[in-house]
C-alpha cells in the first residue's frame, strides 16, 4: 500500500538534486581558488541535513547554520549588486564586471540557484512530487528559509555604497515583499554602508521617464533614509547599452547617458 | 593507476635548502581539478602538511614553515618540485607526496613511497 | 590552527573484537575529517573522509562517524592485516592538521 504523501501546491525538489548541489559544488571551488577548501561532501551534507526528516512547513534558520558555516566567504564588502525581479541582467552584468558580486557569485548562492527542495517528516527521502508555495502553503520552506538566511548575510556583509539593480517594467519598481524588500534593505548596516544605489532598468526602447520618481523608489528612499542610509537612484534607460559599455567603457558612444 | 615517488637528498647538512621532487604517474596537472602536496613525518612522530599546488598553479603553503618553503610544477615533466630553505636537525623526517582533488578539499587520496631526509652536519 | 587530539594513543585487541578510536577537533570543522591507517614503512592509506565515507576499495569493516569537534573511527570485527597506526585528520581549514595517531596492536 503507497503511503500517503502531504500533497503540496509547489514544484517538487529539481530532479537530480543531490548531484546537481555536488557539481555545483566542484566546480565552484574550481573556478575560485580562495574556496578549494571546501568540502563538497561535507557541504552536501550539511545542505541535505538543514531539510531532510524535517517538516517542510518548520524549517529555521538554525537548521542551516552548519551549512552557512560551511560556505563562509569573505567578498568585498564593497562590490556588492542586490537585485530585485532582475536576476538574469545582474548576473549578466557580474559576469563582465568581475569585481562586483551577487547573491549568487558566492558559494552558497550558486548552489541553489533555480533550485527546488524538501523533504518529509520522520523520512529520510527527498520529495520529489510537490514542495511547499510560499503563498499557499507555508513561509518556512526550506527554499524561502535558505534564501532568507543567505540573503540576510549577504546584505549584512554590505559596507560603503551598495547598488541594487531593479526592474522598471514591473508595476512595483520597489516591492516590499521581494526578498530585497522585505530582508535585505532591513539589514543592510548603517554602521557600514555609506549609500544604497539603485539602478532602475528601463524595459522599452522609447521609455525615457525617470522612473527614480515612481512612488515605490521614493518608499524605498524613504525606508533606506530612516535607517540613516544615503540613497541615489540612477535610470538605465538602455540595458543592453549599458552592458555593452560595461565590457567596452572606452567607447565614444558611451559617454552619453544609457 | 595513480602512482607519485619522491626523490632528493637523503642527507642534508643544517642551513642548507633542501629540494625534492614527486614525479608522478596516471596524474595530470594540466588536468582541472587535480593537485599535489607534501606531508612529512619525523621519525615515530604525527604526520604534518607542509604545502599544495592545484593545476593552474593555486599555491597553499603551511603558515608555520611559508616563509622556508617553495612548491613548483612541471606539468609537461609530470613532476611537483618543493624547496626548504635553513634545514635543522628537527627537520629530519620521511617525506611524502600526495594528490588532491577538487571537491574533497584537502583529503590525500593517493600517497608516494616517501623519502626519509636526514638533516645532520 | 585546529588541534585534533586523538585517543588512545595505542591499544590492544583481539582478531574479531570491535575497536574504536576517537579524535576531538579543538574548533567545530563540521564534518571535514579523513582517517588514514599506516603500517610500518609504508605511507598512509586514506580509510575514511568528509567523517563517514568509505574511500574506494575500504572494506565495510571501517567505518567513520561525528560531527562538529567529536569523532568516532570504528573497525567492526578486527583482521590481523588490520595492525596498524591509525590517524584522524581535519581538512576543514588550512593548516590541514592532523591527530598524534592511534597504534593498534594484536593481543
Known amino acids: 500500500v503507497p503511503r500517503w504523501r502531504q500533497q503540496w501546491s509547489g514544484p517538487g525538489t529539481t530532479k537530480r538534486f543531490p548531484e546537481t548541489v555536488l557539481a555545483r559544488c566542484v566546480k565552484y571551488t574550481e573556478i575560485h581558488p580562495e574556496m578549494r577548501h571546501v568540502d563538497c561532501q561535507s557541504v552536501w551534507d550539511a545542505f541535505k541535513g538543514a531539510f531532510i526528516s524535517k517538516h517542510p512547513c518548520n524549517i529555521t534558520e538554525e537548521d542551516y547554520q552548519p551549512l552557512m558555516k560551511l560556505g563562509t566567504q569573505t567578498v568585498p564588502c564593497n562590490k556588492i549588486l542586490l537585485w530585485s525581479r532582475i536576476k538574469d541582467l545582474a548576473h549578466q552584468f557580474t559576469q563582465v564586471q568581475r569585481d562586483m558580486f551577487t547573491l549568487e557569485d558566492t558559494l552558497l548562492g550558486y548552489l541553489a540557484d533555480d533550485l527546488t527542495w524538501c523533504g518529509e517528516f520522520n523520512t529520510s527521502k527527498i520529495n520529489y512530487q510537490s514542495c511547499p508555495d510560499w503563498r499557499k502553503d507555508c513561509s518556512n520552506n526550506p527554499v524561502s528559509v535558505f534564501w532568507k538566511t543567505v540573503s540576510r548575510r549577504f546584505a549584512e556583509a554590505a559596507c560603503d555604497v551598495v547598488h541594487v539593480m531593479l526592474n522598471g517594467s514591473r508595476s512595483k519598481i520597489f516591492d516590499k515583499n521581494s526578498t530585497f524588500g522585505s530582508v535585505e534593505v532591513h539589514n543592510l548596516q548603517p554602521e557600514k554602508v555609506q549609500t544604497l544605489e539603485a539602478w532602475v532598468i528601463h524595459g522599452g526602447r522609447e521609455d525615457s521617464r525617470d522612473l527614480c520618481q515612481d512612488p515605490t523608489i521614493k518608499e524605498l528612499e524613504s525606508i533606506i533614509s530612516k535607517r540613516n542610509i544615503q540613497f541615489s537612484c540612477k535610470n538605465i534607460y538602455r540595458p543592453d547599452k549599458f552592458l555593452q559599455c560595461v565590457k567596452n567603457p572606452e567607447d565614444s558612444s558611451c559617454t552619453s547617458e544609457i | 593507476q595513480v602512482t607519485l615517488k619522491e626523490s632528493g637528498p637523503t642527507l642534508v647538512k643544517p642551513t642548507q635548502t633542501l629540494t625534492l621532487t614527486c614525479t608522478f604517474s596516471g596524474l595530470s596537472l594540466s588536468t582541472s581539478g587535480k593537485g599535489v602536496g607534501w606531508i612529512r613525518q619525523p621519525p615515530g612522530k604525527a604526520l604534518e602538511w607542509l604545502a599544495h599546488?592545484?593545476?593552474?598553479?593555486?599555491?597553499r603553503y603551511n603558515p608555520a614553515l611559508k616563509s622556508r618553503l617553495t612548491i613548483t610544477k612541471d606539468t609537461s615533466k609530470n613532476q611537483v618540485v618543493l624547496t626548504m630553505t635553513n634545514m635543522d636537525p628537527v627537520d629530519t623526517a620521511t617525506y611524502y607526496c600526495a594528490r588532491i582533488e577538487l571537491g574533497r578539499s584537502y583529503v590525500m587520496d593517493y600517497w608516494g613511497q616517501g623519502t626519509l631526509v636526514t638533516v645532520s652536519s | 590552527d585546529i588541534q585534533m587530539t586523538q585517543s588512545p594513543s595505542s591499544l590492544s585487541a583481539s582478531v574479531g573484537d570491535r575497536v574504536t578510536i576517537t579524535c576531538q577537533a579543538s574548533?567545530?570543522?563540521?564534518?571535514?575529517v579523513a582517517w588514514y591507517q599506516q603500517k610500518p614503512g609504508k605511507a598512509p592509506k586514506l580509510l575514511i573522509y568528509s567523517a563517514s565515507y568509505r574511500y574506494t576499495g575500504v572494506p565495510s569493516r571501517f567505518s567513520g562517524s561525528g560531527s562538529g569537534t567529536d569523532f568516532t573511527f570504528t573497525i567492526s570485527s578486527l583482521q590481523p592485516e588490520d595492525i596498524a597506526t591509525y590517524y584522524c585528520q581535519q581538512h576543514y581549514t588550512i593548516p590541514l592538521t592532523f591527530g598524534q595517531g592511534t597504534k593498534l596492536e594484536i593481543k
Open positions: 574548533q567545530d570543522v563540521i564534518t571535514s
Open positions: 599546488i592545484w593545476w593552474d598553479d593555486d599555491k
